[in-house]
Each structure stands twice: as C-alpha cells, then as structure tokens.
Amino acid sequence: EINGSANYEMFIFHNGGVQILCKYPDIVQQFKMQLLKGGQILCDLTKTKGSGNTVSIKSLKFCHSQLSNNSVSFFLYNLDHSHANYYFCNLSIFDPPPFKVTLTGGYLHIYESQLCCQLK
C-alpha cells in the first residue's frame, strides 16, 4: 500500500551480475515477494508456514534467490545494457493478517565497469 523508492541500497554489483535486495519486516511470517522489471514479473518467492511451523518456500518464476529473516535477494547474471530499467520489489503479506501489499523500487543503471564480459 505504501509505494516508493527503496531507502536502502537495493542493487549490489559483483562479478558481472547484480544482487537485488528486497526487504520485508521481520514480523512477517508468510509472504510472497515478486521482482518486477518494469511491469513484468521476473522472479517470485513465496514463504508459507504449515502445521508444526514447517516452512515451505516456493517459486513460480524461478531465479537464483536467497532468503533471510528480513529480506529476499534475487540474483541476475551476465549483465548487459538491456538490464537497465526500473526494478520493483512487490511484497504481499499474508501473515500477520490482514493482507497487505507494498511496492518499492529503484532504477538499475548499468555502467561499462559492471558488465559481465568487457572487451579488452
């Protein structure tokens, strides 16, 4: 419901790739996090809890991802100029109720020094 620019470092570059950091409040137990490029869903990750507090992680649009207790990182590799765009983290909260959606994002600038395979 609260939409805006990420007020943290959302993009972390390394080895010709980028880690896109999508945060969520640590009170949140069950959620879906989608990574959007423009309006297109690139990746998603859903965390649910079953009986006995068993945690289930599912992805419909799979990307290499990493989950912590307050963030989901999505990794994009082999960067080129076509990756430059607005990226958004779309968080849907299921638990605690009630259902909430919040969107935050930023622009990914691609500089020559960050490209995967530069011509020498």
Epitope: E1, Y24, P25, I27, L91, D95, P96, P97, P98, F99
Partner: antibody, heavy 125, light 109 residues
Framework: EVQLVESGGGLVQPGGSLRLSCAAS????????MHWVRQATGKGLEWVSA???????YYPGSVKGRFTISRENAKNSLYLQMNSLRAGDTAVYYC???????????????????WGQGTTVTVSS | EIVLTQSPGTLSLSPGERATLSCRAS???????LAWYQQKPGQAPGLLIY???SRATGIPDRFSGSGSGTDFTLTISRLEPEDFAVYYC??????????FGQGTKLEIK
C-alpha cells in the same frame, strides 16, 4: 472530525438475522482496516471480525460461518451481516478503525484508534 | 492461540495513588503489537497506549506502558478522579488476529 456511527441494532429472535451498518467520516475510509468488537453487559471486549483494505475477511471461531463482514468504500460504510443468531450474541457492537502502516522495512501497529458509540443487539424470544 | 490474562481483576485505590495493572500473554508477543484501552461507564473504549509504551494522541503523561515478551504493565503515576474505569490490554497477531484481556476494573477506595 473522525467519526464512526453504528446503526441496525435491535431485538431479534434466536435463529434470526440482523445487519449492522457503520458510517465513517473524517478520514479516508478505504485506507484503513476495520473491525467489529462486541461487549456483553458487564463483560469484557470480544473481537468479532475484521476486514482488510483489500477486502480480505477474518473471524474468530465463535462467529465463523454465521457472521459476514463487508465494506463499501464508495459509501464509507462497514457492515456486519449476522445470521443464525444466538442468545450469546447479545451485546453492544462497536465499529472500530485499525491503524497500521506497512513498508518494506517496518510494520507499525498504532492500535484500534477510533471507536463508534456502539449499537445494541438483543437476541431473545 | 494467544490468551491475555489481566491482573488484578479489580484494583481499589484512592486519587493521588499510583496504579499498576498487569497483562500477561500465554506466549511471547512483540511489544510493538500490544495496546491498552480505557473504558468509562456507558462509553466506548478509547486507545491509551500502543506499541506497549507509546501514548496515543491526547493521553496525559501520567499514563505509561512497559514490558516485553509475555509481561506487560500499564502504570498510572498519580490517579485523577477521571481515571477510575476499566482497562483492557490487546494484542494483534496471527491466531487469533486480535484478542483482548478480560479487563481490570480500577475503582475508588
């Protein structure tokens, strides 16, 4: 002035139905989650139902399947449809605003910050 | 399911005295998600404290909240005649989404 005004209470026989309404004013109704909370005479507060800004609904076991909460944002109105009423449902019913704000980094809960004056429901033969 | 138990059920004090009301949860809850309400006879409840310790708008500073985990306290440092009422604690969570303690009645001795 921020205000919630309930209506629709009255006397109904066991097994009967009643629809409560709550008119909201003085704030952007569609931006807030809303609750119904009831209180039997001389007793404590009991949460009855909640509806999120997306229209998602929540109930405790005591009313699930019998009560239905709904909202009409265009009319700044909250409703509670009560079916299969029992004597134990007799109470004052309050319409309540829930104040919370969620960002990607924080989940702020500011409590139930606005209450209506209540409407009385009596279930008796 | 989280159950909130308030004590004492009734507290008899005189104006000017200090009141200490307790709210105990059956399992850990985050202090950010605990609130206190005051209800005077014939009136709707009103929000006093949210986030366990933050006063709601317009609430005098003689009211304070504290606690974490399973034990929470509402303190009224110096009772005024208008403070004699029933006080409820409330939590929000997953199951149930919302629950109240049974209340503490603060009466004039």
């Amino acid at each position: 002035e921020v205000q919630l005004v309930e209506s629709g209470g009255g006397l109904v026989q066991p097994g009967g139905s009643l629809r409560l309404s709550c008119a909201a004013s003085g704030f952007t109704f569609s931006s807030y989650d809303m609750h119904w909370v009831r209180q039997a005479t001389g007793k404590g507060l009991e949460w009855v139902s909640a509806i999120g800004t997306a229209g998602d609904t929540y109930y405790p076991g005591s009313v699930k399947g019998r009560f239905t909460i709904s909202r009409e944002n265009a009319k700044n109105s909250l409703y509670l449809q009560m079916n299969s009423l029992r004597a134990g449902d007799t109470a004052v019913y309050y319409c309540v605003r829930d104040n919370r704000k969620v960002t990607h980094e924080h989940y702020y809960y500011y409590g139930m910050d606005v209450w209506g004056q209540g409407t009385t429901v009596t279930v008796s033969s | 399911e989280i159950v909130l138990t308030q004590s004492p059920g009734t507290l008899s004090l005189s104006p000017g005295e200090r009141a200490t009301l307790s709210c105990r949860a059956s399992q850990n809850i985050r202090s950010s998600y605990l609130a206190w309400y005051q209800q005077k006879p014939g009136q709707a409840p009103g929000l006093l404290i949210y986030g366990a310790s933050s006063r709601a708008t317009g609430i005098p500073d003689r009211f304070s909240g504290s606690g974490s985990g399973t034990d929470f306290t509402l303190t009224i440092s110096r009772l005024e005649p208008e403070d004699f009422a029933v006080y409820y604690c409330q939590q929000f969570g997953s199951s149930p989404m919302c629950s109240f303690g049974q209340g503490t009645k603060l009466e004039i001795k």
